[in-house]
């Protein structure tokens, strides 16, 4: 054989390739060895032109040999040398994170090293680099900014060799609200992009809840608890599903009555409803909004309307929640069953935002009576809540 080369070299693997012998051969015998590494020999088929070398030692120079066999005959041996990459450190972790300091720890690579390169970068693009000695497995970061997301990376060094980098992400404390209890507190912490956030009911880190925060509508800080937009999610669900919540928080979903009760029990909240249909928009805001606990069957309180959609929720004020399997409405018939949805029905509805998507039959669709009546199913609807005193909090934060 001829033209022996190695490719795809990592810290533990390499691929040997060669040009086959001109004559037909039975097999090739491959052997490879490195400093302090016993020789390994493998025999492969005569029509093979590459072989994966595995379980190699990192940062080691290997000598690779190959010759062909045909019966008792052996060809001359060809040789190549290659060096495996330096393996990366492992388990990089940020601990003891404070407002301006953090401790980075890691496990060393298998190969011996001459040092480590540490790089840490904040979200605003500030980058710092430091080289530490070969026996170091931790490093204290100082002079960090409070309430800031950092990415820390580490790379092992061995002379000219450099390992791949590994990274960890951490956030320094010093937030106004380390455990935000709603989206308004997340916003006051400096998060201004709408999307998924973790909130902590009553500020308790054991009560984490993933929510979608609307950070743009009317100043932002809203927990979205209902979204209808395309009809992909089934909203004709039972009591248990409405209590717990369902759907994809980035798409169509219901956050859950238990969650609404816990959130609105944290203080005084306001409700906002955003509606869109064929380029038209409308909204309704209620400055008092709460949902009772399971004992009250999640009784609705909604008062103090303003907006452009019309005051359709007032009809439902004081009502308990109804689903097809738990009828709490004041009608002889089961409203949820009749209108294929769930809501704080009375007899039956002015609002049916959990109705059948796209159904323009009377009272069956996604309805907000005082905007589009009962014979038009609205294309997009969101219900969301935030503290009633959000404007005051926002002003205080800006002054601070």
């Amino acid at each position: 054989p001829s033209g022996l080369v190695t490719a795809n070299i990592t810290d533990s693997e390499a691929l040997a390739r060669w040009q086959p012998a001109i004559a037909t051969v039975d097999s090739y015998v491959i052997s490879y060895t490195g400093e302090k590494v016993p020789e390994i020999t493998r025999t492969v088929s005569g029509n093979t032109v590459e072989y994966a070398l595995t379980d190699l030692e990192p940062a080691t120079e290997y000598t690779l040999r190959i010759f062909a066999e045909k019966g008792p005959q052996k060809s001359s041996t060809i040789t190549a040398k290659f060096t495996t990459d330096l393996d990366s450190p492992r388990d990089l972790t940020a601990t003891e994170v404070q407002s301006e300091t953090a401790l980075l720890t890691w496990r060393p690579p298998r190969a011996s090293v001459t040092g480590y390169l540490l790089v840490y970068e904040s979200v605003d693009g500030t980058v710092k680099e430091v080289i530490v000695g070969p026996d170091t497995t931790s490093y204290s970061l100082a002079d960090l900014s409070p309430s800031t997301h950092y990415t820390a990376k580490i790379q092992a060094l061995n002379g000219p060799l450099r390992s791949n980098m590994i990274q960890t992400i951490f956030t320094t404390i010093g937030l106004l609200y380390p455990f935000p209890k709603d989206c308004s507190q997340a916003m006051l912490n400096g998060d201004t992009t709408s999307g998924l956030y973790t909130i902590y009911l009553n500020g308790d880190k054991a009560e984490a809840l993933e929510v979608f925060c609307d950070m743009t509508s009317d100043g932002g800080g809203w927990i979205v608890f209902l979204r209808r937009k395309n009809g992909r999610e089934n909203f004709y669900q039972n009591w248990k599903a409405y209590a717990a919540g369902f759907g994809d928080r980035r798409e169509e979903f219901w956050l859950g009555l238990d969650n609404l009760n816990k959130i609105t029990a944290q203080g005084q909240y306001e409700l906002r409803v955003d509606l869109r249909d064929h380029g038209e928009t409308a909204f309704a805001v209620y400055d008092k909004f709460s949902v009772g606990d399971a004992k009250t069957r999640y009784k609705l309180k909604v008062e103090g309307y303003s907006g452009t959609a019309g005051d359709s929720m007032a009809y439902h004020n004081g009502r308990s929640f109804s689903t097809f399997d738990k009828d709490t409405d004041s009608a002889i018939t089961n409203c949820a069953l009749s209108y294929k949805g769930a809501f704080w029905y009375r007899n039956c509805h002015r609002v049916n935002l959990m109705g059948r998507y796209g159904d323009n039959n009377h009272s069956q669709g996604v309805n907000w009576f005082h905007w589009k009546g009962h014979e038009h199913s609205i294309q997009f609807a969101e219900m969301k809540l935030r503290p009633s005193n959000f404007r005051n909090l926002e002003g205080r934060r800006k002054r601070a």
Partner: antibody, heavy 120, light 107 residues
Framework: QVQLVESGGGLVQPGRSLRLSCAAS????????MHWVRQAPGKGLEWVSG????????YYADSVKGRFTISRDNAKNSLYLQMNSLRAEDTALYYC?????????????WGQGTMVTVSS | DIQMTQSPASLPTPVGDRVTITCRAS??????LNWYQQKPGKAPKLLIY???NLETGVPSRFSGSGSGTDFTLTISSLQPEDFATYYC?????????FGQGTKVDIK
């Protein structure tokens, strides 16, 4: 107890104006919508006008739109109906009615009425 | 406007009999229907709201049913104090409209 007392009715010539008042007591006035409902002699009930609890929304029957104005003074627990350009067909007993809810819905308490006669 | 049609217009009935008054809406109104009783020279009184809910203080012999366009007020056993005119009213949309009334008198 909950009570509504109307006043301001009387005999008036066609084209003239009259202002009806309704004094409410026994409930939190601004928590409820209020209405005027009339009944012509020997006839049935006709809803005339309604106003939301906050006073922010007002509604009228087509027969009085542009001529009558409903208003409320929540500080005084009072409801009003300003009637302009009166016609003979406006002759009726005018009832003040409290709604069961903050928005127009169900008339759960009624006053005893005040008579308006439009005649030359 | 939504038209409300009551029948019958007059209903002579002996004391103790069951009385049924019907009310039909000209369009679908879910359960947005109320029933009132009016005695001569008196203001109307709310009996039933939301089609089937008995107002506080109203005797249980009164009941309401129906949904959509067709509604019924039933007096299970007519008492002397029940002789009056009964009106249905839709609260579904403005203007709120009443039926023309059903007069229940002594037979």
């Amino acid at each position: 107890q909950v009570q509504l007392v109307e006043s301001g009715g009387g005999l008036v010539q066609p084209g003239r104006s009259l202002r009806l008042s309704c004094a409410a007591s026994g409930f939190t006035f601004d928590d409820y919508a209020m209405h005027w409902v009339r009944q012509a002699p020997g006839k049935g009930l006709e809803w005339v006008s309604g106003i939301s609890g906050s006073g922010g929304s007002t509604y009228y029957a087509d027969s009085v739109k542009g001529r009558f104005t409903i208003s409320r003074d929540n500080a005084k627990n009072s409801l009003y109906l300003q009637m302009n350009s009166l016609r003979a067909e406006d002759t009726a007993l005018y009832y003040c009615a409290k709604d069961k809810y903050p928005v127009l819905d169900t008339f759960d308490i009624w006053g005893q009425g005040t008579m308006v006669t439009v005649s030359s | 406007d939504i038209q409300m049609t009551q029948s019958p217009a007059s209903l002579p009935t002996p004391v103790g009999d069951r009385v049924t008054i019907t009310c039909r809406a000209s369009q679908y109104i879910q359960g947005f229907l109320n029933w009132y009783q009016q005695k001569p020279g008196k203001a109307p009184k709310l009996l039933i709201y939301d089609a089937s809910n008995l107002e506080t203080g109203v005797p249980s012999r009164f009941s309401g049913s129906g949904s959509g366009t067709d509604f019924t007020l039933t007096i299970s056993s007519l008492q002397p104090e029940d002789f009056a005119t009964y009106y249905c009213q839709q609260s579904y949309s403005t203007p709120q409209t009443f039926g023309q009334g059903t007069k229940v008198d002594i037979k």
